[in-house]
Amino acid sequence: EVEKTACPSGKKAREIDESLIFYKKWELEACVDAALLATQMDRVNAIPFTYEQLDVLKHKLDELYPQGYPESVIQHLGYLFLKMSPEDIRKWNVTSLETLKALLEVNKGHEMSPQVATLIDRFVKGRGQLDKDTLDTLTAFYPGYLCSLSPEELSSVPPSSIWAVRPQDLDTCDPRQLDVLYPKARLAFQNMNGSEYFVKIQSFLGGAPTEDLKALSQQNVSMDLATFMKLRTDAVLPLTVAEVQKLLGPHVEGLKAEERHRPVRDWILRQRQDDLDTLGLGLQGGIPNGYLVLDLSMQEALS
């Protein structure tokens, strides 16, 4: 912490400008009025202050606003944002998307820091839900953002926001997240025609139940193997060989290369070998002809 010292004669800052870069830390502390700094925060970013000098400026703002900075100051923090701790940010009330964008811009190209995560959390909580514009902004800066949210947090995402989601935004989502996102996507995209609908819904299918996969198999969608491999195992297991063949279309040949991996491996074990043979792919491991297939899930449901 900088010691309180009197400002030397003639050094009192009248405005925030380049001359301040020549001030020592103690001179900045003594000669820059915190209220002046707050009203001219937009100038700070254009001045090449050292990290030590930025520490002093932050200290002055902290003293002026012990309960947290107002949004008028936050919006113009620029690189001073990098000096903020998550504890500082928790005191803020950020409501403007422009403020959020301005601060995300400062961190652009870097991993999501604890500061940014806290900022986003404060912003989303302040808005009450993850609306489309916010989601648009966040996924533009952090494509993996959506998949960093818990299923509980995703539950507050309105279906209209799903339009902002690109396939790459879902790359790291797990089945529990897709569980929540898939029904929202169905609501959002249902008025599109068949082929357009499939293009949009494809990335979300890791949350689809068996019945929807059966329905898709009747629509000549030609699902690629990468999408098929991301489907829920429990949703794939009840599909018949004919249904998988229709679902994958020309991509069905790819099953051979994936026969040792889930969900293909587990699905093969549930099919009659005779049925698998009709694909002509040499898939092995099905139930031999003449064996009785017991549906244990049905037995459990009855007991």
Epitope: R176, D179, Y182, P183, R186, L187, G207, E211, D212, R232
Partner: nanobody, 121 residues
Amino acid sequence: QLQLQESGPGLVKPSETLSLTCTVSGGSISNSYYWGWIRQPPGKGLEWIGSIYHSGNTYYNPSLKSRVTISVDTSKNQFSLKLSSVTAADTAVYYCVTQDGVGATTTEEYWGQGTLVTVSS
């Protein structure tokens, strides 16, 4: 077209358990993607309480998680909410919600009309 109707006591004493049932008519709830509960305290916004998904996974609002249980009885076409150790802060209009259309070409979200639950001694 599904119709949802919440039922349960309108008045609950502090520290007791709030129990609500949502009865669905006009279709089978087996065709739903999820069954959930949402509430709106007087003068405040909507607050998601929790949902059970078709996959069997259950998700609860973290701030309520230790007190909430949601269950589904597809044979009765009902799902229910239990919220334990209630306080005056749990006074709200409670809505049940579901989204049907599993295996169908269209899907829709349906809400009950809501039931006011007051927590008071």
